[in-house]
């Protein structure tokens, strides 16, 4: 946030500007948490704006008995390698298919044993606040899906009917990472010493970091007439005074018409 | 690119034989798996049998005792010799290569495919 100036008091605010704010020649340069002219002004709304999507990564081990472990396969660039990774890929976009979270899978390492295949199973899901439910409720439809896959594709009398065909006990699942987005932890970080007055409001599912002095917000601070100020003890009511009223309390909601104090009389409306 | 190219098939009379070819290019036919399938008019592409870089050979229920599987690895060509065929056997029979030692006789484990020769058993 920048405020610009010009003439000769330039020389003057260049020495001014607060919070860190830096002199470019024309113009204090702001922080993000500050604006006004000499930056003395704390923003009253934080962009904390959520990532698009959210993903997350589970870490499987299954086995596949309908192929014999080669020593190619160790090697991830040999030919048995990346058909291997098509014919699995293809197999598991097809246990999958049902899961709208599904983006995918990665093989991490193939190891003898029949083949054991380490993988990863790539989910993501649009942003929303109910993102680690929808997350959660894909992964165990994934545990799910690969558990009954597992058990139904099985070698009879040594020959696989399906694409693929597994061990049955030999899957596992070994790790789920979540993406972590944390609205309320960026917005008070981002705060940084306001962070005890910023809160986060959500708005078409969106979340924002705000201070009682953005307005709009079920938090907002009415002022009436005055201006919202946030300083470090809070968000404070800057009162006006009119050609005719001054304002005070703590939301200048009070106004006192000028001419009945000059003739000693006080009027509250 | 892998090529398989099949020959061999052809009108047979019922208890007859036909032998069956498949030349591999670009394909190391010692290694992974070489397989024949067939699909009949109207009917799903289903395995006939395979055999595996080592020699081991498997077959489906309905040719066992009757069809024998080979390989040559001298000369990259995979072979189909079928006896007592019956008019249940006509079908257009595919010869199908993977680099995988597979043990499964499901169409889609195998990525590479001839375009197929056409197997008639009618007197």
């Known amino acids: 946030r920048t405020t610009t100036c010009f003439g000769d008091g330039c020389q003057n605010t260049a020495s001014r500007c607060k919070n860190g704010g830096t002199w470019d020649g024309l113009k204090c340069q702001c922080p993000n948490l500050y604006y006004g002219e000499l930056c003395e002004e704390v923003v009253s709304s934080i962009d904390i704006g959520p990532p698009e999507t959210i993903s997350a990564q589970m870490e499987l081990t299954v086995t596949v008995t309908s192929v014999k472990f080669t020593e190619e396969l160790k090697n991830h660039s040999s030919q048995e390698f990346q058909e291997f990774k098509q014919t699995f890929t293809e197999q598991m976009n097809i246990v999958y298919s049902g899961i709208p979270e599904y983006v995918g899978v990665n093989i991490t390492k193939l190891r003898l044993g029949s083949v054991v295949v380490e993988h990863d199973v790539l989910l993501r899901t649009k942003y929303t606040p109910e993102y680690k439910t929808v997350l959660d409720n894909a992964t165990e439809v994934v545990k799910e899906k690969i558990t009954k896959v597992t058990t139904q594709q099985i070698m009879i009398n040594d020959i696989c009917s399906d694409m693929m065909c597994f061990n049955t006990t030999g899957t596992q699942v070994q790790n789920i990472t979540v993406t972590q987005y944390d609205p309320e932890e960026d917005c008070r970080k981002m705060a940084k010493e306001y962070g005890d007055y910023f809160v986060v409001e959500y708005r078409d599912q969106k979340p924002y970091c705000i201070s009682p002095c953005e307005p709009g917000f079920s938090v907002s601070k009415n002022c009436n007439l005055g201006k919202c100020q946030m300083s470090l003890s809070g968000p404070q009511c800057l009162c006006v005074t009119t050609e005719t009223h001054w304002y005070s309390g703590e939301t200048c909601n009070q106004g006192t018409q000028k001419s009945l104090v000059y003739g000693h009389h006080h009027h509250h409306h | 690119d892998v090529q398989l190219v099949e020959s061999g098939g052809g009108l047979v009379q019922p208890g007859g034989s036909l032998r069956l070819s498949c030349a591999a290019s670009?394909?190391?036919?010692?290694?992974?798996?070489m397989a024949w399938f067939r699909q009949a008019p109207g009917k799903e592409r289903e395995g006939v049998a395979f055999i595996n870089s080592d020699g081991r050979t498997s077959y489906a229920e309905s040719v066992k005792g009757r069809f024998t599987i080979s390989r040559d690895n001298a000369k990259n060509s995979l072979y189909l010799q079928m006896n007592s065929l019956r008019a249940e056997d006509t079908a257009v029979y595919y010869c199908?290569?993977?680099?995988?030692?597979?043990?499964?006789?499901?169409?889609?484990?195998?990525?590479?495919w001839g375009q197929g020769t056409m197997v008639t058993v009618s007197s």
């Open positions: 199908a290569a993977s680099l995988l030692y597979l043990m499964t006789v499901n169409a889609a484990a195998y990525p590479y």
């Open positions: 670009g394909f190391p036919s010692s290694r992974g798996t």
